[in-house]
């Protein structure tokens, strides 16, 4: 005989669990319907009536199939050092990420709670490890024969130009200056053989913002369904 299709709510067979998009309610001791993403449980199921779902209100969401009594509050608006990469909808929370030139110093479940400006390496120091979304720049002193004359979160130490005759030796924060005879580093004919000025590509810094606000008893369970022998069900 073909198995009868059970309609929620129903008592699960011993040794089985509820089906996909259903859950086992501890109070009713029944398999009941979940609410879809964007909804929540307005009325919980009983032995004789199924879950009643309702849409999430503005600025609240549920992303999962659920039976929560209230939708979750979306996180607060993104701060000035952040970009909103996902808007708050009934099915998803707002996600804020750090804008260019900043990194996430304190992450949260999704996105970033606190952004901080990327460190800038001062003259005499270059970038050893670039910044990422979640890590700051690491600076290192320029080794002999290399220099950096910028305050930058991106510039690395560069080799000194090699002169036939040195006018001013280079150091960690300044390139070598050659006399008017050509340096061995190739340059176009007729060019002025002085080091080219390097723009200090420093980005304006802002003070680190305050973090944005994000949004027992012992017991024995009733004789419920034995959990499944094979793969899991539900969402």
């Amino acid at each position: 005989l073909p198995a009868q299709v059970a309609f929620t709510p129903y008592a699960p067979e011993p040794g089985s669990t509820c089906r996909l998009r259903e859950y086992y309610d501890q109070t009713a001791q029944m398999c009941c319907s979940k609410c879809s993403p964007g909804q929540h449980a307005k009325v919980f199921c009983t032995k004789t009536s199924d879950t009643v779902c309702d849409s999430c209100e503005d600025s609240t969401y549920t992303q999962l199939w659920n039976w929560v009594p209230e939708c979750l509050s979306c996180g607060s608006r993104c701060s000035s050092d952040q970009v909103e990469t996902q808007a708050c909808t009934r099915e998803q929370n707002r996600i804020c990420t750090c804008r260019p030139g900043w990194y996430c110093a304190l992450s949260k479940q999704e996105g970033c709670r606190l952004c901080a400006p990327l460190r800038k390496c001062r003259p005499g120091f270059g970038v050893a490890r670039p910044g990422t979304e979640t890590s700051d720049v690491v600076c290192k002193p320029c080794a002999p024969g290399t220099f950096s004359n910028t305050t930058s979160s991106t510039d690395i130490c560069r080799p000194h130009q090699i002169c036939n005759v040195v006018a001013i030796p280079g150091n960690a924060s300044m390139d070598a200056v050659c006399t008017s005879t050509s340096p061995t580093r190739s340059m176009a004919p007729g060019a002025v053989h002085l080091p080219q000025p390097v723009s200090t590509r420093s980005q304006h810094t802002q003070p680190t913002p305050e973090p944005s606000t994000a949004p027992s008893t012992s017991f024995l369970l009733p004789m419920g369904p034995s959990p499944p022998a094979e793969g899991s069900t539900g969402d």
């Epitope: 859950y23 086992y24 309610d25 501890q26 659920n66 479940q109 959990p227 539900g234 969402d235």
Partner: nanobody
């Protein structure tokens, strides 16, 4: 849809220790309250321990208080149960289960189950 796989069970002598793991895939475990539930042969289900969605609250059955510790590692998407001073009466199949956005313990209902891991305490 989250899938759960338990591991770490086995045979241990009374007074011994085990650490159970529950690895989640398909969804982030930190969206859920998670619990360890056990069932001994011929006995009813018992929720051994629970940790809420926010991770701010845990709960233990009286029978395991002071001996078991629940924890979660969201970066590994895994739930743990450290079981110390094991007793013969702890022998059961241990399951992890979830409640989406569950804010209190014990759980109001059970969502996804793993396949279970058998813990046997015997000399």
């Amino acid at each position: 849809e989250v899938q759960l796989v338990e591991s770490g069970g086995g045979l241990v002598q009374p007074g011994g220790s085990l650490r159970l793991s529950c690895a989640a895939s398909g969804s982030r475990l930190d969206y859920y309250a998670v619990a360890w539930v056990r069932q001994a042969p011929g006995k009813e289900l018992e929720e051994v321990s629970c940790i809420t969605y926010s991770g701010g609250s845990t709960n233990y059955a009286d029978s395991v208080k002071g001996r078991f510790t629940i924890s979660r590692d969201n970066s590994k998407n895994t739930l743990y149960l450290q079981m110390n001073s094991l007793r013969a009466e702890d022998t059961a199949v241990y399951y992890c289960t979830t409640e989406p956005y569950g804010s209190s313990c014990p759980l109001s209902g059970y969502d996804t189950w793993g396949q279970g891991t058998l813990v046997t305490v015997s000399s």
